[in-house]
């Protein structure tokens, strides 16, 4: 697909479905193949609300 | 404040070069992939290309690659579009975008969160 | 490349009206899908990520939902600022490819 080889801690079969290990603050992200900077999720203790802090996220209405 | 914003749109005749920009601010865009996004004039959205900054690795549409190089400059946190050999039908409004990644068992879910406000560019002789 | 399909291209609708937008993938793509609206001459927008994930700020009358290869944006009650063209995407793989939209119209 054009991509240029990626960093030894990252490298992994295009077709893989176990990415290697990643920093603490990262995790894999299969569309670029590679490490990247990771947010965490975050439940909200009550329901569906439009008002987060940005970089928050609810809970997927069907569940995990 | 997270802010995406292009520059370098303009007109150029076909086979022409332009070099577009994406200065990102309120954060770093070595943390994330940043991508090319653009859409032709009434038609819907069309990737172009990523980049993540921090090792330089990139991918392309193929309807532009070999024509377009992504990159980045990390110390200035600006990515670049460089397209040559336009064509006609390269005419589009061309946006960067910021791909965000929430982590779900060390694994990205992530979008495209932030858009800069596009840059038109034109192909026409 | 993983093609994605959206259905209907177009739509109208009225004012508290419940819509719902659908996006068929070529191939399994898990539940890499977000969704975006977009309004003319407007960049798009973040609506939903990881197909049922609501994107902070998003008011909660949008939902998203499916898996696999097929996806659902729905906006449980109209509201005038509503009428815009939505997009589907799919990051599962590159390239990632967008659906071809679908504009919401007022009746």
């Known amino acids: 697909m054009g991509a240029r080889r990626l960093r030894v801690r990252s490298q992994r079969s295009r077709d893989s479905s176990v990415p290697t290990q990643c920093n603490q603050t990262e995790c894999f992200d299969p569309l670029v193949r590679n490490c990247v900077s990771c947010e965490l999720f975050h439940t909200p203790d009550t329901g569906h609300t439009s008002s987060l802090e940005p970089g928050t996220a609810l809970q997927p209405q069907e569940g995990s | 404040e997270v802010q995406l914003v292009e520059s370098g749109g303009g007109l150029v005749q076909p086979g022409g070069s332009l070099r577009l920009s994406c200065a990102a601010s309120?954060?770093?865009?070595?943390?994330?992939?940043i991508h090319w996004v653009r859409q032709a004039p009434g038609k819907g959205l069309e990737w172009v290309a990523w980049?993540?900054?921090?090792?330089?690795?990139?991918d392309y549409a193929d309807s532009v690659k070999g024509r377009f190089t992504i990159s980045a400059d990390t110390s200035k946190n600006t990515a670049y579009l460089q397209m040559n050999s336009l064509r006609a039908e390269d005419t589009a409004v061309y946006y960067c975008?910021?791909?965000?990644?929430?982590?779900?068992?060390?694994?990205?879910?992530?979008?495209?969160?932030?858009w800069g406000q596009g840059t038109l560019v034109t192909v026409s002789s | 490349d993983i093609q994605m399909t959206q259905s209907p291209s177009s739509l109208s609708a009225s004012v508290g009206d419940r819509v719902t937008i659908t996006c068929r993938a070529s191939?399994?793509?898990?539940?890499?899908v977000a969704w975006y609206q977009q309004k003319p001459g407007k960049a798009p927008k973040l609506l939903i990520y990881?197909?049922?994930f609501l994107y902070s700020g998003v008011p909660s009358r949008f939902s998203g939902s499916g898996s696999g290869t097929d996806f659902t944006l729905t906006i449980s009650s109209l509201q005038p600022e509503d009428f815009a063209t939505y997009y589907c995407?799919?990051?599962?793989?590159?390239?990632?490819?967008f659906g071809q939209g679908t504009k919401v119209e007022i009746k």
């Open positions: 309120g954060f770093t865009i070595s943390s994330n992939s």
């Open positions: 975008a910021r791909r965000v990644c929430y982590d779900r068992a060390r694994v990205c879910a992530g979008a495209m969160d932030y």
């Open positions: 980049i993540t900054p921090s090792d330089g690795n990139t």
């Open positions: 995407q799919q990051s599962y793989s590159t390239p990632p490819t």
């Open positions: 191939q399994d793509v898990s539940t890499a």
């Open positions: 990881s197909a049922s």
